[in-house]
């Protein structure tokens, strides 16, 4: 469809609530300093020409692109250099070539102060102006997430009011609150840490790696429907993604209640599990849709090996219409194993193509061909292996051991990575332990891999901003669904030179007494690391001595009347302990 | 619900020349691959030619290459059989038949296609 008026179109189908949303988010995922008032003043000043062209389409500039508008309105800012340098640079640029110089300078490790709640004053900024409380949310999580996926943010803000509807009635707001805004906290950040992934394989690896991702795990969610309702909505959903992923918020969510609006139309084709989505209102909805039970198995599938193996046609099919026939051969694959990971899906699927590559050349392509579905046991083993081998350290050791044992790994592995990107990977990392170790067998696999491919997402797009090593480069460029078993062949690198022992490292303070347990951990996982730089050869008797040491300092120091006093006295002792310790 | 109805069997002599079709329907059917299979009297039901849908690509068993020729028209939701140079081994019922959804032939088992149109008879004799 064309309309005259490609933002009063959007403004028409999105309705003022979540035009102002929306348009919010995509300024606070450019401008990540501004403060939350300077935006709300853009955000008036394009509702109110939005509603100029709805009210006439043939209005002056209601013509233009909806890029060409939102980069006007960045670009006149007057204090944009000053506050965003080069960023201002892109100002002198035409569309599109503005537009992705704009998405060049997203940051994703914005240096913005972590958020902590107060229960007491958020409760009377809430009852005081829920609008602007609910836009503050938008603003704070999409500056801190310049990736995060617009439509799905809105869906979290109606939950984050709904917490606090219920929960500034209660007596005890804080017992109320507090639990709550942490479990969404969670979801909040592996949403983000989602959408980041997407973002990064349609950027990186192109529309059809994504494709590829989406065919795989919607096979698995809906193995009842077939290989072309699968294919359509993986085209409309890459169109959604790959719109969120450039900045085109507006466009995005439209598209993503179409997609809705499709599989609840065509549910009974699709899946038995989307009932209870389908009645819910447009955000819960898609919210719903995208997290969706996984629906059974049709029982009448039959062995993959007619279609893909015993066929005469399999070269045919492979020559002639290959991403066709490689397709359809991930959707059968998928859908069969609910239970493997997307990579690891991906990963076969590369093996079955190599395969065919070579044996389609060949003299006998079928008896060359005939054994291809040998050659997976081998890639389903690995990561099974792996992950049995690591809940078992993670049930021996608990989390807080776990993450400290994933510390001494990817240190030695990458030492050249920033001290602070190695403790927030390897505490992720850690994580999967407690998210994924007490699931059931079946699910622990695609729990734990599809979790870790997350994670080292966050290494890869960290390193690529500040690039040090090239093994992490490496990994992270040559196949995004080899990425995790690449960073696990990982060995210590020998070559490192070791860090020159810097006392201001392993100086501590009084505050660290007072700190919360998580950010307790992270100072000591900090000085692990530091540690393991300066000697990368550290035994694990020298580096559990140490730690010990450490804690017993801090602990002593705690105690005492005067905190600093003792932090002054003991940390140098402290330090002379730890260098004879590694001496 | 995938439908197929095939027509234009008939009697016709050795070396002439006839035209199935079938009209199919059903979400999606332009996207879905259909074959001819055939059935002689106590014979299994083999597969005769077979073409992609959505995807420009044809199939042949040995027995019918070069003498018979597949097409579809997607305007038309029809699929075509046109069978040149008959021989009476080409006697037979034949069959339209589909697997929703599947883009190509991936399969020439009679058994994995669930849907199947009622048949139409070809004679060839003089």
């Known amino acids: 469809d064309t309309y005259k008026s490609e933002i009063a179109h959007r403004f028409k189908d999105l309705g003022e609530q979540y035009f102002k949303g929306l348009v919010l988010i995509a300024f606070s995922q450019h401008l990540q300093q501004c403060p939350y008032e300077e935006h709300v003043k853009l955000v008036r000043e394009v509702t109110e020409f939005a509603k100029t062209c709805v009210a006439d389409e043939s209005a002056e500039n209601c013509d233009k692109s909806i890029h060409t508008l939102f980069g006007d309105k960045l670009c006149a800012i007057p204090s944009l250099r000053e506050h965003y340098g080069d960023l201002a640079d892109c100002c002198e640029k035409e569309e599109p070539e503005r537009n992705e110089c704009f998405l060049q300078h997203k940051n994703d490790n914005p240096d913005i102060p972590k958020l902590k709640p107060d229960p007491v004053a958020l409760c009377a900024d809430f009852q005081e102006d829920e609008q602007k409380f609910w836009g503050k949310y938008l603003y704070e999580i999409a500056r801190r997430h310049p990736y995060f996926y617009a439509p799905e943010l809105l869906y979290y803000a109606i939950i984050y009011k709904d917490v606090f509807s219920e929960c500034c009635q209660a007596a005890d707001k804080a017992a109320c609150l507090l639990p709550k805004i942490e479990h969404l906290r969670e979801k909040v950040l592996t949403s983000a840490a989602k959408q980041r992934l997407k973002c990064a394989s349609i950027q990186k690896f192109g529309e059809r790696a994504f494709k590829a991702w989406s065919l795989a795990r919607l096979s698995q969610r809906f193995p009842k429907a077939d290989f072309t309702e699968i294919s359509k909505i993986v085209t409309d959903l890459a169109k959604v993604h790959k719109e969120c992923c450039h900045g085109d918020l507006l466009e995005c969510a439209d598209d993503r209640a179409d997609l809705a609006k499709y599989i609840c139309e065509n549910q009974d084709t699709i899946s038995t599990k989307l009932k209870e989505c389908c009645d819910k209102p447009l955000l819960e909805k898609s919210h719903c849709i995208a997290e969706a039970k996984r629906d059974e198995l049709p029982a009448d599938l039959n062995p993959l090996e007619h279609d893909f193996v015993e066929d005469k046609e399999v070269c045919k099919n492979y020559k002639e219409a290959k991403h066709v026939f490689l397709g359809t051969f991930l959707y059968e694959y998928s859908r069969r194993h609910p239970d493997y990971s997307v990579s690891l899906l991906l990963r076969i699927a590369k093996i079955y193509e190599a395969t065919l590559e070579d044996c389609c050349a060949k003299e006998d392509p079928p008896a060359c061909y005939a054994t291809v579905f040998d050659k997976f046991q081998p890639l389903v083993d690995e990561p099974k292996n792996l992950i049995k081998q690591n809940c078992e350290l993670f049930e021996k050791l608990g989390e807080y051991g776990f993450q400290n044992a994933l510390i001494v790994r990817y240190t030695k592995k990458v030492p050249q990575v920033s001290t602070p990107t190695l403790v927030e990977v390897a505490r992720k990392l850690g994580l999967v332990g407690s998210r994924c170790c007490k699931r059931p067998e079946e699910e622990r696999l695609s729990c734990a891999e599809d979790y870790l491919s997350l994670v080292l997402n966050r290494l890869c797009v960290l390193h690529e901003k500040t690039p040090v090593s090239e093994k992490v480069t490496k990994c992270c460029t040559e196949s995004l669904v080899n990425r995790r078993p690449c960073f696990s062949a990982l060995t210590p690198d020998e070559t490192y030179k070791p860090k020159e022992f810097v006392e201001g490292t392993f100086t501590f303070h009084a505050d660290l007494c007072t700190l919360p347990e998580d950010e307790k951990q992270i100072k000591k996982q900090t000085a692990l690391v530091e540690l393991l730089k300066h000697k990368p050869h550290a035994t694990e008797e020298q580096l559990r001595t140490v730690l010990g040491n450490f804690a017993a300092f801090v602990q002593k120091c705690c105690a005492a009347p005067d905190h600093e006093a003792c932090f002054a006295v003991e940390g140098p002792k402290f330090v002379i302990e730890i260098r004879g310790i590694l001496a | 619900e995938v439908q197929l109805l095939e027509s234009g069997g008939g009697l016709v002599q050795p070396g002439g020349s006839l035209r199935l079709s079938c009209a199919a329907s059903?979400?999606?059917?332009?996207?879905?691959?259909v074959a001819w299979f055939r059935q002689a009297p106590g014979k299994e039901r083999e597969f005769v030619a077979g073409?992609?849908?959505?995807?420009?690509?044809?199939y042949y068993a040995d027995s019918v290459k070069g003498r018979f020729t597949i097409s579809r028209d997607n305007s038309k939701n029809t699929l075509y059989l046109q069978m040149n140079s008959l021989r009476p081994e080409d006697t037979a019922v034949y069959y339209c038949?589909?697997?929703?959804?599947?883009?190509?032939?991936?399969?020439?088992?009679?058994?994995?296609?669930?849907?199947w149109g009622q048949g139409t008879l070809v004679t060839v004799s003089s």
């Open positions: 038949a589909a697997r929703p959804g599947q883009p190509l032939i991936t399969s020439k088992v009679a058994d994995l296609y669930p849907y």
């Open positions: 059903g979400r999606y059917i332009d996207e879905t691959a």
């Open positions: 073409i992609g849908g959505g995807v420009d690509i044809t």
